[in-house]
């Protein structure tokens, strides 16, 4: 599957929107930093099959969508930017769904990528628990925003690698 150029652009647009969403000075949030244990090995295109990496990225976008669709998230971020962010994520989900299906076939996807999808889900579970523990404070959201930006940046690099392999 050749991930379309539009998908990469969409990912870059999503990153720009995430960057614009910041509301408070991150300098005041240093003590709130946290190790969420980003499952980098899941996104390693060399070590794992391409379909596995793509479906893990699909899960990451789905979980990001879920995270930023909550009531607490709506209260934390600018509504207009959030809406634009949803649109980018939705578009990316569509692109990736087509890609994963083409790469493996629907019936094989669930079984084959169970471990990598589970790793991504656990990662987002840690993020959710962190936010809850911090009572969804502005700084906690800033830390999470920075973390999601890093995850997105990492997966953007993965996509470039996957396109080169094609």
């Amino acid at each position: 599957c050749d991930l379309p150029q539009t998908h990469s652009l969409g990912n870059r647009r999503a990153l720009i929107l995430l960057a614009q969403m910041g509301r408070i000075s991150h300098f005041s949030c240093l003590k709130d930093r946290y190790d969420f244990g980003f499952p980098q090995e899941v996104f390693d295109g060399n070590q794992f099959q391409k379909a596995q990496a793509i479906s893990a990225f699909h899960e990451m976008i789905q979980q990001t969508f879920n995270l930023f669709s909550t009531k607490d998230s709506s209260a934390a971020w600018d509504e207009t930017l959030l809406d634009k962010f949803y649109i980018e994520l939705f578009q990316q989900l569509n692109d990736l769904e087509a890609c994963v299906t083409q790469e493996v076939g629907v019936e094989e996807i669930a079984l084959m990528n169970e471990d990598s999808i589970l790793a991504v889900r656990k990662y987002f579970q840690r993020i959710t628990l962190y936010l809850m523990g911090k009572k969804y404070s502005p700084c906690a959201w800033e830390v999470v925003r920075a973390e999601i930006m890093r995850s997105f940046s990492f997966s953007t690099n993965l996509q470039k690698g996957l396109r080169r392999k094609d």
Partner: antibody, heavy 121, light 107 residues
């Protein structure tokens, strides 16, 4: 390969202005903050201030507030440290280093080679 | 500002010795403590971050421990290339601050 390359050594007279630079390469420049550290001859490290190149938000150590200005130009992946009026006591080695911001990653993992500033009449 | 106090300010040791340097913060900094090594004429080099995480490429003879206000850098078996000055630095809150340094010299 991640690199922070600083501008060359400077010899200045008291009262003169100066701007030294730190150019980042091999990584996303706006994803990391850039900090500046002073080391006077034979002395220890002193933290001066930090900038987030993505929005140029800057913070200074109280000791350096009003004495220096930290800035950045993200279009050319470069951070700057400047003085409007140098003093003999500004003679030191100045280092830049990158910081991962709010991400859980090593602090100040890459450093510039340093810029030696000598202020003498 | 958070004050960082290192001890000792200098020490003499032999190759193969176990060396311990301590760093105390004037208030709790959780685990946001870094250790750097600096050799004359060179930029500092990160050894340990978040109190106990070994930076990539740093030999395993270096280790860090502690949290809150008291921290330790240990070199399990001193090597000739380890003679240098070591600094602790807190990154819990701005302004970041360094300890005054510990110079490790050859006995």
């Amino acid at each position: 390969e991640v690199q922070l390359v600083q501008s060359g050594a400077e010899v200045k007279k008291p009262g003169e202005s100066l701007k030294i630079s730190c150019k980042g390469s091999g990584y996303s420049f706006t994803s990391y903050w850039i900090g500046w550290v002073r080391q006077m001859p034979g002395k220890g490290l002193e933290w001066m201030g930090i900038i987030d190149p993505s929005d140029s938000d800057t913070r200074y150590s109280p000791s350096f507030q009003g004495q220096v200005t930290i800035s950045a130009d993200k279009s050319i992946s470069t951070a700057y440290l400047q003085w409007s009026s140098l003093k003999a006591s500004d003679t030191a080695m100045y280092y830049c280093a990158r910081h991962p911001g709010l991400n859980w990653a090593p602090d100040f993992d890459y450093w510039g080679q340093g810029t030696l500033v000598t202020v003498s009449s | 500002d958070i004050q960082m106090t290192q001890s000792p300010s200098s020490l003499s040791a032999s190759v193969g010795d176990r060396v311990t340097i301590t760093c105390r913060a004037s208030q709790s900094i959780s685990k946001f403590l870094n250790w750097y090594q600096q050799k004359p004429g060179k930029a500092p080099k990160l050894l340990i971050y978040f109190a106990s995480s070994l930076q990539s490429g740093v030999p395993s003879r270096f280790s860090g421990s502690g949290s809150g206000t008291d921290f330790t850098l240990t070199i399990s078996s001193l090597q000739p290339e380890d003679f240098a000055t070591y600094y602790c630095q807190q990154s819990n809150t701005l302004p970041f601050t360094f300890g005054q340094g510990t110079k490790v010299e050859i006995k």
